[in-house]
């Protein structure tokens, strides 16, 4: 069964600065990566980013980098001052279209006691069948 | 099939504003992020800027900050451009399209004459 | 800003002839975490707007002929017309999807003897 697994980290040197990274773990080919925060995509939750694997990368505010890693990996970096300013507290998900799995999407957020530069190491979330 | 219906052309005087919409109905998610292109000479294209729905957040070309504001009314579908302090330089055809171009608008063709 | 250089700017071919013309960036469009280069090829018939033919480099848009093919890597580029067609009268234009802004090339006008 294909996992997603999601990883959030608070950078030391910019407080409001974070580090989104997100994996797929499964065989299929990746159609299509969707960063959202707020909740699921699709279900209140706010895009930050798009990604294609052939198509391009796109963001938008507070996102300021997306980028993929490798070829299941992508990393997204946040920063932002005021409304539109990421908190401790807030669910950041990713949503991965594959072949011919379907869609999956998992969702996390800064482990509650970790200091600025640390985080949780990347474990799949609960993931969401979206079809 | 994804449709992206924008308005009729527009003759418009030196110095005023005008604002172009793109009404797109579509069955993905990424149907509804709109890029705006414009078209001079019939000839260059110049990516103006992309909308996301979700929040109005907005990318712009550098070349068209101040020229160009982009909206988003997310409950009817439409993206909107507005174009101000219009010059004979903003005559073109602009192009709205989906994220990674591959549904475009028919064009609206903007006139600036005294 | 990337800027992306087509040449040459207009060609003039007979029906069933091979054309390839070329595209080359200012900067390199691969993307390094995944291996793939962002850029796109477009055809533009007269009073119509751009039609995406080609994406990833090499990647046919679906519906588009197999008489299209898109090649190269990082700064260099070309697009082939294996056996040109009547219906292929058009200008094509190459575009930087790697880097906001997403910039044009200045169009290859593809006329038909």
């Known amino acids: 069964t294909p996992e997603v697994w999601v990883q959030v980290r608070m950078e030391a040197t910019e407080l409001s600065s974070f580090t989104i990274r997100c994996g797929f773990l499964g065989s299929g080919s990746i159609s299509l990566v969707t960063v959202s925060w707020g909740g699921p995509n699709g279900a209140g939750g706010t895009t930050l980013a798009v990604l294609h694997p052939e198509r391009g990368i796109r963001q938008w505010a507070p996102a300021r980098q997306a980028r993929w890693e490798t070829q299941s990996s992508i990393s997204l970096i946040l920063e932002g001052s005021g409304a539109s300013s990421p908190c401790a507290n807030t669910t950041f998900c990713c949503k991965f279209a594959s072949f011919p799995e379907g869609s999956w999407e998992a969702c996390g957020s800064l482990p509650p006691s970790s200091d600025p530069g640390l985080s949780a190491p990347p474990t799949p979330a609960p993931i969401l069948r979206a079809d | 099939e994804v449709q992206l219906q924008q308005s009729g052309p527009e003759v418009v005087k030196p110095g005023a504003s005008v604002k172009i919409s793109c009404k797109a109905s579509?069955?993905?998610?990424?149907?509804?992020?709109i890029n705006w292109v414009k078209q001079s000479h019939g000839k260059n294209l110049e990516w103006i800027g992309d909308?996301?729905?979700?929040?109005?957040?907005?990318n712009y070309n550098q070349k068209f900050k101040g020229k160009a504001t982009l909206t988003v009314d997310k409950s009817s579908g439409t993206a909107f451009m507005g174009l101000r302090s219009l010059t004979s330089e903003d005559s073109a055809v602009y192009y709205c399209?989906?994220?990674?171009?591959?549904?475009w608008g028919q064009g609206t063709t903007l006139t600036v004459s005294s | 800003d990337i800027v992306m250089t087509q040449s040459p700017s207009s060609l003039s071919v007979s029906t069933g002839e091979k054309v390839t013309m070329s595209c080359r960036s200012s900067q390199s469009l691969l993307n390094s975490g995944n291996q793939k280069n962002y850029l796109a090829w477009y055809q533009q018939k007269p009073g119509q707007p751009p039609k995406l033919l080609i994406y990833?480099?090499?990647t046919r848009e679906s519906g588009v002929p197999d008489r299209f093919t898109g090649s190269g890597s990082g700064t260099d580029f070309t697009l082939t017309i294996s056996s040109v067609q009547a219906e292929d009268l058009a200008i094509y234009y190459c575009q930087n999807a790697h880097t906001s802004p997403y910039t044009f090339g200045g169009g290859t006008r593809l006329e038909i003897k």
């Open positions: 909308i996301n729905p979700d929040n109005g957040a907005g």
């Open positions: 579509g069955n993905t998610l990424t149907d509804y992020f």
């Open positions: 399209a989906t994220l990674y171009f591959d549904y």
């Open positions: 990833g480099a090499s």
